[in-house]
């Protein structure tokens, strides 16, 4: 199977890598514009310059390119407790982060939110805090798993998962209460 | 008692728009990030668009920039999401919901309200 491709994709095919067609003229191939560059005039023949122009600030381009217009610089969502890890520059785009001892949750895609990373008070760490991974906690005796927090048995409710882990604590408390009602 | 309660779902056409509202009850709505959030039939959560405490940063999922805006207003205890230029794709039960700042959770979910886009 040929796999489909778009105008623009057909149309550099037809020129050797780090040229594309000319768009008035398919019979010209202009070179691409550097990275941290974009396309203000295609090239006017065959051998010619194409005439490309820097980034202006507030904009990128992180790799060879026909753009006529650069990109725009990402700012970091600071209503996700995400910080600036490198800024953009003409070439790349903002990195954008979270704090030492956080992690990132994507919501999606191209959404992160940033968390403390969990310290496993009354259980021990299993895994530890990644770049995008909560640390992995597994909890003492007596203490059950809920939104990766080692809780006491003693919140642990019938109907609840944690029931298998605390079941010797479920019984002992039900045979206290037992034995005060005559 | 905390309460978050959607309005303003409904059907219409390709192409309509919609408003919803987002009446929020019980908790100190000024403060912090309030999110909307949509299951289409059959599908997982989708991220549609949030809004911080002032209004000041917003952010839309790729599938509907340049075509819905969320807004809110603290002093009713309120967020909206418009919805211009409905498409089939946007058929969904929207949720308002609160993100926690402590856990990759929601503090708080509304009940949902139905969003039919068909001709």
């Known amino acids: 199977l040929v796999p489909h491709l778009g105008d623009r994709e057909k149309r550099d095919s037809v020129c050797p890598q780090g040229k594309y067609i000319h768009p008035q003229n398919n019979s010209i191939c202009c070179t691409k514009c550097h990275k941290g560059t974009y396309l203000y005039n295609d090239c006017p023949g065959p051998g010619q310059d194409t005439d490309c122009r820097e980034c202006e600030s507030g904009s990128f381009t992180a790799s060879e390119n026909h753009l006529r217009h650069c990109l725009s610089c990402s700012k970091c969502r600071k209503e996700m407790g995400q910080v600036e890890i490198s800024s953009c520059t003409v070439d790349r785009d903002t990195v954008c982060g979270c704090r030492k001892n956080q992690y990132r949750h994507y919501w999606s895609e191209n959404l992160f939110q940033c968390f403390n990373c969990s310290l496993c008070l009354n259980g021990t760490v299993h895994l530890s805090c990644q770049e995008k991974q909560n640390t992995v906690c597994t909890c003492h005796a007596g203490f059950f798993l809920r939104e990766n927090e080692c809780v006491s048995c003693s919140n642990c409710k019938k109907s609840l998962e944690c029931t298998k882990l605390c079941l010797p604590q479920i019984e002992n408390v039900k045979g206290t209460e037992d034995s005060g009602t005559t | 008692e905390v309460q978050l309660l959607e309005s303003g779902g409904g059907l219409v056409q390709p192409g309509g728009s919609l408003r919803l509202s987002c009446a929020a009850s019980g908790f100190t709505f000024g403060n912090g990030v309030m999110a909307w959030v949509r299951q289409a039939p059959g599908k997982g959560l989708e991220w549609v668009s949030h809004?911080?405490?002032?209004?000041?940063?917003?952010y839309y999922a790729d599938s509907v920039k340049g075509r819905f805006t969320i807004s809110r207003d603290n002093s009713k205890n309120t967020l909206y999401l418009q919805m211009n230029s409905l498409r089939a794709e946007d058929t969904a039960v929207y949720y308002c919901?609160?993100?926690?700042?402590?856990?990759?959770?929601?503090?708080?979910w509304g009940q949902g309200t139905l969003v039919t886009v068909s001709s």
């Open positions: 809004i911080n405490e002032n209004g000041g940063a917003t």
């Open positions: 919901a609160k993100p926690s700042i402590e856990s990759p959770i929601f503090d708080y």
